[in-house]
Amino acid sequence: DYKDDDDKGWVWNQFFVPEEMNTTSHHIGQLRSDLDNGNNSFQYKLLGAGAGSTFIIDERTGDIYAIQKLDREERSLYILRAQVIDIATGRAVEPESEFVIKVSDINDHEPQFLDGPYVATVPEMSPEGTSVTQVTATDGDDPSYGNNARLLYSLIQGQPYFSVEPKTGVIRMTSQMDRETKDQYLVVIQAKDMVGQAGAFSATATVTINLSDVNDNPPKFQQRLYYLNVSEEAPVGTTVGRLLAEDSDIGENAAMNYFIEEDSSDVFGIITDRETQEGIIILKKRVDYESKRKHSVRVKAVNRYIDDRFLKEGPFEDITIVQISVVDADEPPVFTLESYVMEIAEGVVSGSLVGTVSARDLDNDDSSVRYSIVQGLHLKRLFSINEHNGTIITTEPLDREKASWHNITVTATETRNPEKISEANVYIQVLDVNDHAPEFSKYYETFVCENAVPGQLIQNISAVDKDDSAENHRFYFSLAQATNSSHFTVKDNQDNTAGIFTAGSGFSRKEQFYFFLPILILDNGSPPLTSTNTLTVTVCDCDTEVNTLYCRYGAFLYSIGLSTEALVAVLACLLILLVFFLAIIGIRQQRKKTLFSEKVEEFRENIVRYDDEGGGEEDTEAFDISALRTRAVLRTHKPRKKITTEIHSLYRQSLQVGPDSAIFRQFISEKLEEANTDPSVPPYDSLQTYAFEGTGSLAGSLSSLGSNTSDVDQNYEYLVGWGPPFKQLAGMYTSQRSTRD
């Protein structure tokens, strides 16, 4: 070909390349510009899809090669661009030109049945000429050129039942067929390209033609009489046997229902197994060999679905007789209970009676039964059973604290037939006996200051007991009778704890470094048990503020939650408070009306200073000023944001006398008036009345100020809502209230 372009142009030869060339590279042709007269140095470039991969050009000569085998069926046309460059100038000598490489077709594809192998279904007994299916082959060759892709269909296998249309590939039935005779036909169809001419490729497809079922056959029992057996020990619902009426049809056309036509005693029933189409004869009532040894029933099988077109083939049902023999059975002994629950107290002597199990042989009342215990290899034998009468006894005393329940398995065996064995579980509960004395719940390190005053709490103690801790389990604490110690007293808190108090003063490390207090702890078991536990009290050298200087100084400080720095701060506060309280005592007799009921004995010995005056918005949310206007001070539950306030605590001697509440009333009234009248003054909401002590608390008072002994008006029900961590606290407060009420 020659392309003229203003007296300049491209010259090339071939632009066709046959597909499927087997050489590693195939010369397609040569690009050449007519300006290339041999005097110039021209470089030829190939551009476009396929350049450099499918097609390679020798840029020096313009020769184009196909370096891959080409497949027209994959791609039949390549559009490429050519460029010629003068080596001397590096410029294109003429415009880029587009050219086409066509891949020419060869008959290299066989016809293909892409959807094969084919499976078709046609109902049995269909009339002649019924279309079964259509097969279609495709040929990858060029359908627009020649006969490479033109196909003809023919039947290779399948006569005389089927035929195929040569051009369309439609398969038809040529005769009526019965599925019960043959349900599947293999038909082979051939497709040939080149319209069947010489050199044609062909392909075959197998068509599996299935004949679908129609209900043209009734059910049929194989026998007129069936024999079945049933054991007399068979429970109601037992399958006695299965019957099958055969139907040469399939699927729902073979589906049938079974009925019992004659069974006056109504002992047997029949159900249809939808999966297997069997009739399952089941026991509706227990049979007894001794009363009736043979039963006879009449069973009918009826097709569930009838096809109107084949009614003439009917009736679609069949009948048979089933004779059922009752088989005598030897049953194992039967325990009176499936499982037994027995009780025995712990500690009882070996050979004590636990309980009795009983089993009997239903087949023969005279037959004796032998009892035994199934012994686990790893278990200690704690029980034995009388093999004749089933009584279970202990083989050694039991300890509830080791195991509160024992599970054993007993067996009953027929003496005349040892193979007949039955089992029963026996659950033995070991009942608690108060056989453990109470003891301290932990080791106590107790200290007392040399300058301690009488009535000072030095230790709280509690006890534990290994016995069954029922809800009403109680411990009582007292000093052992043997001691004549006048130094300490034990106060039982009535809540399974006790407080150790100083009875006198004047302790001296020089005289006596340790005191050994024998504490008697009594439980409320039956009979009650006591134990004596020794509490060691160490005498400590303390300063006037009851701060231990020796005797594990650090540990003691830690126990009251104070660092040295905190102690200094507390002492400073103490001086201020002393001045304040002296002033209150001086004026005390002037006022007799009380805001709080005063009980001196309720005063505690700890002073706690709460430095949280006037917290602004934080406090406004936390306090209700209206509470200050009421005579009875109520504790209302209000949410308060978490405010960390430093609480300084220090021990000091009990004042033994409470301040006059009238002074407080006057003080509150003045401050309240000031807050109500002067808008510049912040709400006077920092008065905090600590008149409510948790008397049930083991920790004792937080405050050394006197407390209102009557907090009956308080409602502690909200504590219950605080969840499991506060369960014990809630129990203490709510139970206290209920006992008061």
């Epitope: 590279s25 010369h27 140095s41 390679i56 020096r60 090669y65």
Partner: antibody
Framework: QVQLQESGPGLVKPSETLSLTCTVS????????WSWIRQPPGKGLEWIGY???????NYNPSLKSRVTISVDTSKNQFSLKLSSVTAADTALYYC????????????????WGQGTMVTVSS | DIVLTQSPGTLSLSPGERATLSCRAS???????LAWYQQKPGQAPRLLIS???SRATGIPDRFSGSGSGTDFTLTISRLEPEDFAVYYC?????????FGQGTRLEMK
């Protein structure tokens, strides 16, 4: 490292065909141009022709009528056939690689074989 | 065909001296596609310079090439004993590829 090794008979009778093979080792023959160059004893170098790995060839016009260069990519070899030889064809024959990678204009010969001496004599 | 003429035919110099080899083309060499080779007795030629001035891999920098069109030069700035050999120029700007007749550089 790519190496070239020429092989073939050292003696060829006049009028017969000279056949030489160059084996490429240490690299692929693909994507390069491969040339034959000869050097008569005591004389200068003469380019005979090249073959591109796809089979494209270009020969020196002075020898074009007698020369055939072919390639066997599967063996990583290319060959020279020079027909109707005379004594003037006696020379040291070199195979060399054009340093141009992939198709493009000519380039210098960066890799050479050690050469094989062919004598044309009866 | 492009004819390449090298001069001088023989150049006698001592080690350490500067050598200048000339190559003249009968017509302009397109794209300065000119190369220089060194050949020692019993060895194949070794590429020194391509594209008139680009040193081949591993070639010492004492070798340099210059020129364009028809006149090209190979310069060895300071001769080493191993530099004494025959030097060929080659053009590849136009087919057929041609070589010069060579310049023998010998030790004085």
């Amino acid at each position: 490292q790519v190496q070239l090794q020429e092989s073939g008979p050292g003696l060829v009778k006049p009028s017969e065909t000279l056949s030489l093979t160059c084996t490429v080792s240490g690299g692929s023959i693909n994507s390069y141009y491969w040339s034959w160059i000869r050097q008569p004893p005591g004389k200068g170098l003469e380019w005979i022709g090249y073959i591109y790995y796809i089979g494209s060839t270009n020969y020196n016009p002075s020898l074009k009528s007698r020369v055939t260069i072919s390639v066997d990519t599967s063996k990583n070899q290319f060959s020279l056939k020079l027909s109707s030889v005379t004594a003037a064809d006696t020379a040291l024959y070199y195979c060399a690689r054009d340093s141009r990678y992939r198709s493009g204009w000519y380039d210098a010969f960066d890799i050479w074989g050690q050469g094989t001496m062919v004598t044309v004599s009866s | 065909d492009i004819v390449l003429t090298q001069s001088p035919g023989t150049l006698s110099l001592s080690p350490g001296e500067r050598a200048t080899l000339s190559c003249r083309a009968s017509q302009s060499v397109a794209g300065s596609y000119l190369a220089w080779y060194q050949q020692k007795p019993g060895q194949a030629p070794r590429l020194l310079i391509s594209g008139a001035s680009s040193r081949a891999t591993g070639i010492p920098d004492r070798f340099s090439g210059s020129g364009s069109g028809t006149d090209f030069t190979l310069t060895i700035s300071r001769l080493e004993p191993e530099d004494f050999a025959v030097y060929y120029c080659q053009q590849y700007g136009k087919s057929p590829i041609t070589f010069g007749q060579g310049t023998r550089l010998e030790m004085k």
